[in-house]
């Protein structure tokens, strides 16, 4: 059987075969060692028992999509069936304490490699044998501990496979430089140790996807706007913008981007070298947000121009390989490539509650003589929109241990000029966050605030 | 001078939908929140719904919560009340008030009455 | 059972000072204002004080209102026989996120 038999039916035309070599990867027309690695199909009975105690599960990830010439990194996390772990020496081992569906194990190993390796004979000297190899015969590396590396992963995308041994998490990059754009399927089998041979345990497949489109997202933030996530924004106060590029391989770490931001609010066009930016809307609407990313990236070198023909035949100046057109095309040639990404957003503008400030606190007289609480008026001013809420958030002095948390509809006219009044329970010094909102704004202002002792020494005071 | 006024009332059986609306005048409708009270015959007040002044703020009872809806279109100074799936015990007269931290202004009330 | 507790009903005679008290908790009096409304019998109710104490204009300063810790109480002095009404205090509670009533009290001006 061949490997392209084995790992599955996504095969690529021959086109991709002979011009998408991944460095380090090898064809999957090779030879698959079904003797050592057997193949099981899907539903086989046998998958049943692969494992004591239940099915292993893999899970794939990657960090697509990935911009053409940067490397994917793939990740396979192996998930055991409930109270098996792998320890320190890549044993799979009951954890203590967890009780499963068969009860506390009296047996602290589900599998005991250790003791398969040191029991396994036919080595030669260099502890290299007929079985420490992948399924197409390389022999294991032989990195410090690689004997605790139990299990062995398969990849397998665009007609070609790379063979790894690893624990029960194992890493794999990719360089993307000649992969096809758009979605791609990578597939991934895993096999366990198994005496002499290695039984299947998992397979799993995910679509990553390769862009020569930069991948950028935009986040937008604007003080006291309620609901960041729902692209409504207030007028009069500036939005940062904070464009993100998602580039997991740092492959554009060195190049120069710009950003050419349009806000859709006849303000032009604005360029800039910076990823984050302030803009204020004026208006009240709906405006259609560009951003073009451009950066140039390392990439494929232009074909040579044809040399000129020559009307005559000239005498040749030297040996072929000495022209000097020639040597300006070295193979290694870093060649540079604008690529582009882009962000579009709509985002709506209304108005907003703009500033809360407390102008005045005044200590309420009590008709009580020595009251246990001590009532205190806040009287507040806004701009911007009318407030439908104020809540207060009352703690201790470092503003960090809440004690109470107030909110109340709150009835305002258009000068915004409102009194809160709230309970202080004994003397003390206390941080006020006070909020005032509205549908989509929500705007603070702290206070502290110093409420006296309730004895006759000590008079009622306002305290600022 | 600020004037509330009810209307929609008038009888209807359990499980049926009666809509009240409010027309409001003398103050900039706009700017204010509004609400329900209602009152069942020979008992107290009971708050039932209140709306701020652009209507994106929504407040319901308990005793009314998904059955009653409350909404209000500022272009006509109108507010509304609209009561679905009605009980017995929804049998009251249902006032308009201005505002919802207080009620400094109300309207003369419409009577529901829920009944087969 | 209302939120706001209030005895269901006062009496006094003409010139007398009649109180009317309202308990609640510290998520409707005591954080909240509390708002006294007045019902003659046969009409709406009309708003006698708000913010605790204040009188909007033209109701007479007869009528006066306080509130300590989660109690609140109106003050009715110089009673007339047209003070005949039930009373009923109102808060907001910011637990419950509603608009909440005391029973009513109901007064009576004897004589």
């Known amino acids: 059987k061949r490997f392209h038999d084995v790992l599955g039916n996504e095969r690529p035309s021959a086109y991709m075969r002979e011009h998408n070599q991944l460095n380090g990867w090898s064809s999957d027309e090779n030879d698959w060692n079904e003797k050592l690695y057997p193949v099981w199909k899907r539903g086989d009975m046998r998958w049943k028992n692969s494992w004591k105690g239940g099915r292993v599960q893999a899970v794939l990830t990657s960090d697509s999509p990935a911009l053409v010439g940067s490397n994917i990194t793939f990740a396979v996390n192996l998930i055991f069936p409930r109270c098996q772990k792998e320890d320190a020496n890549g044993n799979i081992v009951y954890e203590k304490n967890c009780r499963n569906e068969a009860g506390l194990s009296a047996d602290p190993y589900v599998y005991n490699w250790t003791a398969w390796s040191e029991d396994s004979d036919g080595e030669n000297g260099t502890g290299q044998s007929h079985h420490n190899v992948f399924p197409d015969g390389k022999p294991f590396p032989h990195h410090p501990g690689w004997r605790r590396w139990n299990f062995i992963y398969v990849f397998h995308t665009l007609g070609q496979y790379f063979q790894k041994l690893g624990r029960c998490s194992v890493r794999v990059s990719v360089n993307t430089a000649n992969v096809t754009l758009g979605p791609q399927l990578m597939e991934v089998t895993v096999y366990r140790r198994h005496g002499r041979a290695y039984v299947p345990i998992a397979q799993v497949k995910d679509v990553y996807v390769v862009t020569d489109q930069i991948p950028v997202f935009v986040t937008m933030f604007q003080k006291n706007d309620r609901n960041s996530s729902d692209e409504t924004f207030l007028k009069d106060l500036p939005i940062m913008f904070d464009v993100l590029i998602h580039d997991p391989s740092h492959f554009l770490n060195y190049s120069t981007i710009n950003y050419k931001w349009s806000f859709g609010d006849n303000t032009g066009l604005f360029v800039s070298t910076n990823h984050t930016v302030n803009h204020t809307y004026v208006l009240n609407g709906t405006f259609s947000l560009n951003l073009t990313v451009k950066a140039a990236a390392p990439g494929p070198c232009p074909p040579p121009p044809p040399p000129p023909r020559p009307s005559k035949p000239t005498p040749s100046l030297g040996p072929a390989g000495d022209n000097p057109l020639e040597l300006s095309r070295i193979p290694d040639e870093n060649c540079q490539i604008n690529r582009y990404g882009h962000f579009q957003a709509t985002i709506t503008i209304v108005e907003g509650i703009l500033e809360v400030n407390i102008i005045q606190m005044t200590d309420v007289l009590m008709p009580v003589p020595w009251p246990e609480s001590s009532l205190i008026d806040f009287v507040v001013t806004c701009q911007g929109s009318i407030p439908t809420e104020v809540c207060t958030i009352i703690s201790d002095p470092t503003c960090e241990i809440t004690q109470n948390t107030v909110c109340s509809p709150v009835d305002v006219d258009e000068m915004c000029l409102l009194t809160v009044r709230r309970t202080f329970n004994g003397s003390g010094t206390y941080c006020v966050n006070l909020t005032l909102g509205d549908d989509t704004s929500l705007a603070l202002t702290s206070t502290l605030i110093s409420v006296p002792d309730r004895d006759p020494a000590s008079p009622l005071r306002m305290a600022n | 001078e600020v004037q509330l006024l009810e209307s929609g009332g008038g009888l209807v059986q359990p499980g049926g939908s009666l809509r009240l609306s409010c027309a409001a005048s003398?103050?900039?409708?706009?700017?204010?929140?509004m609400s329900w009270v209602r009152q069942a015959p020979g008992k107290g007040l009971e708050w039932v719904s209140s709306?701020?002044?652009?209507?994106?703020?929504?407040y319901y009872a308990d005793s009314v919560k998904g059955r009653f809806t409350i909404s209000r279109d500022n272009s006509k100074n109108t507010l509304y009340l609209q009561m679905n799936s009605l009980r017995a015990e929804d049998t009251a007269v249902y006032y308009c008030?201005?505002?919802?931290?207080?009620?400094?202004?109300w309207g003369q009330g419409t009577l529901v009455t829920v009944s087969s | 059972q209302s939120v706001l507790t209030q005895p269901p009903s006062a009496s006094g005679t003409p010139g007398q000072r009649v109180t009317i008290s309202c308990s609640g908790s510290s998520s409707n009096i005591g954080n909240n204002y509390v708002s006294w409304y007045q019902q003659l019998p046969g009409t709406a109710p009309k708003l006698l004080i708000y913010a605790d104490s204040q009188r909007p204009s033209g109701v007479p300063d007869r009528f006066s209102g306080s509130k300590s810790g989660t109690s609140a109480s109106l003050a009715i002095s110089g009673l007339r026989s047209e003070d005949e009404a039930d009373y009923y205090c109102g808060a907001w509670d910011s637990s419950l996120n509603a608009y909440v009533f005391g029973g009513g009290t109901k007064l009576t001006v004897l004589g």
């Open positions: 003398g103050f900039t409708f706009r700017a204010r929140p």
């Open positions: 709306i701020s002044h652009s209507g994106g703020s929504k």
């Open positions: 008030a201005r505002k919802w931290s207080t009620f400094d202004y």
